[in-house]
């Protein structure tokens, strides 16, 4: 009997109720491998998520984040709010980088300016909230 199920391709499930024939996955479900006993519910990209790839009978839907948010986690499991360059996301929302730190992206945290003097160099261009300092020659 197991051999019959192994013949069921992706996009179907092995139907125990009907002599283990291969039945098509119901709408809004999929099976990505052969021989499955059930299909899996398709991921739904709602709210801050938007659909990047529609679900098919053989593969799950893939989500992106709507404008103003970016993906976090495996397979974009979460969406995090974008901030402007020169800011970082805190529990109270987007906050400007403190003096001496910068963030050149819309995500992530503010990082300290490079300390040129540690390498025996001088500051060629001062840092800003959005850009790191540029170190000059020694």
């Amino acid at each position: 009997l197991q051999d019959l199920c192994s013949n069921c391709p992706a996009g179907t499930f092995c139907d125990n109720n009907r002599s283990q024939i291969c039945s098509p996955c119901p709408p809004n479900s999929f099976s990505s491998a052969g021989g499955q006993r059930t299909c899996d519910i398709c991921r739904q990209c709602k709210g801050v998520f938007k659909t990047r790839k529609e679900c098919s009978s053989t593969s799950n839907a893939e989500c992106d984040c709507i404008s103003g948010y970016h993906c976090l986690g495996a397979e974009c499991s979460m969406c995090e709010q974008d901030c402007k360059q020169g800011q970082e996301l805190t529990k109270k929302g987007c906050k400007d980088c403190c003096f001496g730190t910068f963030n050149d992206q819309k995500r992530g945290i503010c990082r300290p300016w490079t300390n040129c003097s540690l390498d025996g160099k001088s500051v060629l261009v001062n840092g800003t909230k959005e850009r790191d300092v540029v170190c000059g020659p020694s």
Epitope: F13, R37, C39, Q44
Partner: nanobody, 122 residues
Framework: EVQLLESGGGLVQPGGSLRLSCAAS????????VGWVRQAPGKGLEWVSA????????YYADSVKGRFTISRDNSKNTLYLQMNSLRAEDTAVYYC???????????????WGQGTLVTVSS
């Protein structure tokens, strides 16, 4: 006892129309994800249309979009499939089906009855 009884099939000429009915007993159609599956001669099963409350939408196979319409009458506990502009390739046995969501997250479907045969031929 849960039962689904399909009716309304028959012989129709290409371009013609039919309305299939599926009378349910033993459960409420309005509380379920239900639809129609067909099996053409010598072919495998194919989903045709479904009403999916889980997804909040109706589903149609690409091959029937714009020609078939699924609906249900909750007062009669009956599911319908209005089939217009029928083609020879729509010839099949049509089954009423219920989508089943399992506790472990899996999805299958079940159906009952003998189905109803639709033959499109001139």
């Amino acid at each position: 006892e849960v039962q689904l009884l399909e009716s309304g099939g028959g012989l129709v000429q290409p371009g013609g129309s039919l309305r299939l009915s599926c009378a349910a007993s033993g459960f409420m159609l309005s509380a379920e994800d239900v639809g129609w599956v067909r099996q053409a001669p010598g072919k495998g099963l194919e989903w045709v249309s479904a009403i999916l409350d889980f997804g909040g939408s109706t589903y149609y196979a690409d091959s029937v979009k714009g020609r078939f319409t699924i609906s249900r009458d909750n007062s009669k506990n009956t599911l319908y499939l209005q089939m217009n502009s029928l083609r020879a390739e729509d010839t099949a046995v049509y089954y009423c089906a219920r989508v089943v969501y399992h506790a472990g997250g899996g999805v299958t479907f079940d159906y009952w009855g003998q189905g109803t045969l639709v033959t499109v031929s001139s």
